[in-house]
């Protein structure tokens, strides 16, 4: 095992900026921090096959799949996607690791699938497998929160029936007018579904997930109806 190269697989997620970078590139565009994909040796596979955690991205996202190889000497490589071979230009970083990158621009269904990277080094040959799919955001919803009084307790539950499950927070303000803006020092935020002590002149519950944030204001009349 210690004879095998140390492989690091990362995903780089790019902010969409209509850059005209080619499909396979050694120098990806300016982007967010690399995200480790937990590359692991695939058990019971013929040959040395590493697999990266499954990548799930939004449609139209631009990403880079990148492999860093800690192996002595030169490396040569080849990308294969849906039976097509794609050229590969490895380069070396400051730590003398071989770096191989595949840039996928504006992700579409046709670009989803298995990306195989074949690497040949002086010591050994191995394959790295990336699986890229498009996240199904059609199922995502963000609904405005509503309130329910807890049975036998002097407490309120804030509910938002959203997918993925939202983060729910109470926003409480004990002041009048302008000073109840969210950045105001008069505002108290509690990131919990259940509120045990009601205080303030302005009480709201907010739910947020990947689709954004929705808030509902609690009026005194609601307390009698929940």
């Amino acid at each position: 095992n210690q004879d095998l190269p140390v492989i690091k697989c990362v995903l780089i997620n790019h902010k969409n900026n209509d850059s005209s970078v080619g499909k396979s590139s050694s120098y990806p565009m300016v982007s967010e921090s690399p995200e480790d994909l937990g590359c692991a040796l695939r058990p019971q596979s013929s040959g040395t096959v590493y697999e990266a955690a499954a990548v799930e991205v939004d449609v139209s996202a631009s990403i880079t799949l990148q492999v860093l190889v800690d192996a002595p000497g030169n490396i040569s490589c080849l990308w294969v996607f849906k039976h097509s071979s794609l050229n590969c230009q490895p380069h070396f970083d400051l730590q003398n690791r071989g770096v191989v990158s595949m840039v996928i621009l504006k992700m579409t269904e046709t670009q989803a699938g298995e990306y195989l990277l074949f690497i040949q080094s002086e010591a050994t040959n191995y394959t790295i497998l990336f699986t890229v799919s498009i996240r199904n955001t059609l199922l995502y919803t963000l609904r405005r929160p509503y309130f329910r009084k807890m049975e036998n307790q002097d407490a309120l539950v804030c509910i938002s029936e959203s997918v993925p499950e939202p983060i729910v927070e109470w926003v409480l303000c004990d002041s009048q007018g302008e000073s109840c803006k969210e950045e105001s020092p008069a505002v108290v935020k509690k990131e919990e579904k259940v509120l045990h002590e009601l205080f303030g002149t302005d009480i709201r519950c907010c739910a947020r997930n990947e689709l954004g944030r929705e808030c509902t204001r609690l009026f005194t009349i609601d307390l009698n109806q929940t």
Epitope: N13, G38, Q44, A53, E210
Partner: antibody
Framework: QVTLKESGPVLVKPTETLTLTCTVS??????????VTWIRQPPGKALEWLAH???????SYSTSLKSRLTISKDTSKSQVVLTMTNMDPVDTATYYC???????????????????WGQGTMVTVSS | DIQMTQSPSSLSASVGDRVTITCRAS??????LGWYQQKPGKAPKRLIY???TLQSGVPSRFSGSGSGTEFTLTISSLQPEDFATYYC?????????FGQGTKVEIK
């Protein structure tokens, strides 16, 4: 570099609710099939799996503690939160969070368990 | 729930010894098993996954075998840094469960 860091109260009173936060860096809970799990270890005892949550919001809980546990994630803060209600002195333990990468198997996913762990946070339950 | 029974619960050995730890599952778990090493005051570290695949960076003196209900962790030649507690973990079905641990001590 992949890191996970647990944070939360050092001391909790019996019957109170414990809220623990796992802040992750070096990997994402959005763009890859990744999970975060919670494990605990009472002093001098074995490891006990508590719960986990995946990037697709799939969750699982320990059978014996299911009624007391809630796991959630806040991807914008790269955090996973575990709450445990009605704490008791027997819940005194070191609580760890760890990462679980998910690998594609056709239309399904496969997990090899936890590959990277946080350093743990000790929680004492006492009045 | 699947019960994982580890044996022995502790053992004494000398540097250079061959050490074998066994983990038995109460029902078949294919090869959905990992081995973890834990040193006092530290977090566990994965040694083996999928019953027999060595984690990257782990010395080759560690090896795992087995499938179904019987699994083994072997340290071919015990080194001073190997004195620790070892746990097996099944991740075949929920809830995931650990063995009770095997403490490897210096003879």
């Amino acid at each position: 570099q992949v890191t996970l860091k647990e944070s939360g109260p050092v001391l909790v009173k019996p019957t109170e609710t414990l809220t623990l936060t796992c802040t992750v860096s070096g990997f994402s809970l959005i763009n890859a099939r990744m999970g975060v799990t919670w494990i605990r270890q009472p002093p001098g005892k074995a490891l006990e799996w508590l719960a986990h949550i995946f990037s697709n919001d799939e969750k699982s809980y320990s059978t014996s503690l299911k009624s007391r546990l809630t796991i959630s994630k806040d991807t914008s803060k790269s955090q996973v939160v575990l709450t445990m209600t009605n704490m008791d002195p027997v819940d005194t333990a070191t609580y760890y969070c760890a990462r679980i990468p998910g690998y594609s198997r056709g239309w399904d996913y496969y997990y090899y368990g936890m590959d990277v762990w946080g350093q743990g946070t000790m929680v004492t339950v006492s009045s | 729930d699947i019960q994982m029974t580890q044996s022995p619960s502790s053992l004494s050995a000398s540097v250079g010894d061959r050490v074998t730890i066994t983990c038995r599952a109460s029902q078949g778990i294919r090869n959905d098993l990992g081995w973890y090493q834990q040193k006092p005051g530290k977090a566990p570290k994965r040694l083996i996954y999928a019953a027999s695949t060595l984690q990257s960076g782990v010395p080759s003196r560690f090896s795992g075998s087995g499938s179904g209900t019987e699994f083994t962790l072997t340290i071919s030649s015990l080194q001073p840094e190997d004195f620790a507690t070892y746990y097996c973990l099944q991740h075949n079905s929920y809830p995931w469960t650990f063995g009770q641990g095997t403490k490897v001590e210096i003879k």
